[in-house]
Amino acid sequence: QQQTLPKPFIWAEPHFMVPKEKQVTICCQGNYGAVEYQLHFEGSLFAVDRPKPPERINKVQFYIPDMNSRMAGQYSCIYRVGELWSEPSNLLDLVVTEMYDTPTLSVHPGPEVISGEKVTFYCRLDTATSMFLLLKEGRSSHVQRGYGKVQAEFPLGPVTTAHRGTYRCFGSYNNHAWSFPSEPVKLLVTGDIENTSLAPEDPTFPADTWGTYLLTTETGLQKDHALWDHTAQNLLR
């Protein structure tokens, strides 16, 4: 006999990165017939919703009208059908952005490179922060963490055309409070290097430090709950 129901899916609309004082909705999708949904924040009960009629609703929304640093953190949800509770959802990291200052993103050797060149991004912020985040925008966005007193380096290693795209960075004051985003830098990667060697013995940046996260909503991907659950927004873990 089943002791728990399948875990629900949790996601944020329009985005899990929320500018301060802006609104965000945390969505929790369970099963039809669920009589109660609970949203937990940092391990404690935060809000409860009882859908009516439960047999016609399989998703609830918890609205946050005014995002701030106190509301940023890890959320999860559970639901109940009768007396049977579900497994908890994966954790949703809700991040408040546009805090304090704006970093500067720079790229060596430049915004236009040839496939095979070693590219390094630098994120600089003079205020008190030691963690930085580099994001590549797109359908399946990449986030990389770096550390430094006022600046972090993000070596991409020898690049390919797959590295093409628009990059931004943030300074992080804590795991869930980020600065304003930098202005974007668009990296253009063309062709192949001819008749030159680029020190292939140099180590490339280890691939396992990249996470893949869905940071855009234009494509409607955030409705693809299976994909969201797979990526799980495990940005900070």
Epitope: T104, L105, V107, H108, P109, P184, T196, S197, L198
Partner: nanobody
Framework: QVQLVESGGGMVQAGGSLRLSCAAS??????IHWFRQAPGKEREFVAR????????FYADSVKGRFTISRDNTENLVYLQMNSLKPEDTAVYYC????????????????WGPGTQVTVSS
């Protein structure tokens, strides 16, 4: 003490050639970039070269006319400029490990003082 010094500038007729040099001393660098700045205009990227490997990259405006090269033993980087045009007139600067910023310009901790190139028609 880190130093970059350009030389080789001068006056030349349109269609002529010049070779600029950039002498780098004080430490090793990954790349040397050449930039130029014409009167009343923004500083613009011209070309770059990696010390190790020698990979090069050029701005479209100079591709096929300018060649950047290096002499590792002498710590020199050259910019060979052929088929010069009046619009190539500018002060030419070399910079070490320059980075393009999200504010739309290049920055570097190490710039040379520049050398003037004037191309007359």
């Amino acid at each position: 003490q880190v130093q970059l010094v350009e030389s080789g500038g001068g006056m030349v007729q349109a269609g002529g050639s010049l070779r600029l040099s950039c002498a780098a001393s004080g430490r090793t660098f990954n790349t040397i970039h050449w930039f130029r700045q014409a009167p009343g205009k923004e500083r613009e990227f011209v070309a770059r070269i990696w010390w190790i490997g020698g990979a090069t990259f050029y701005a479209d405006s100079v591709k096929g006319r300018f060649t950047i090269s290096r002499d590792n033993t002498e710590n020199l980087v050259y910019l060979q400029m052929n088929s010069l045009k009046p619009e190539d007139t500018a002060v030419y600067y070399c910079a070490a490990d320059a980075r393009y910023t999200s504010h739309g310009y290049y920055e570097s901790d190490y710039w040379g003082p520049g050398t003037q190139v004037t191309v007359s028609s």
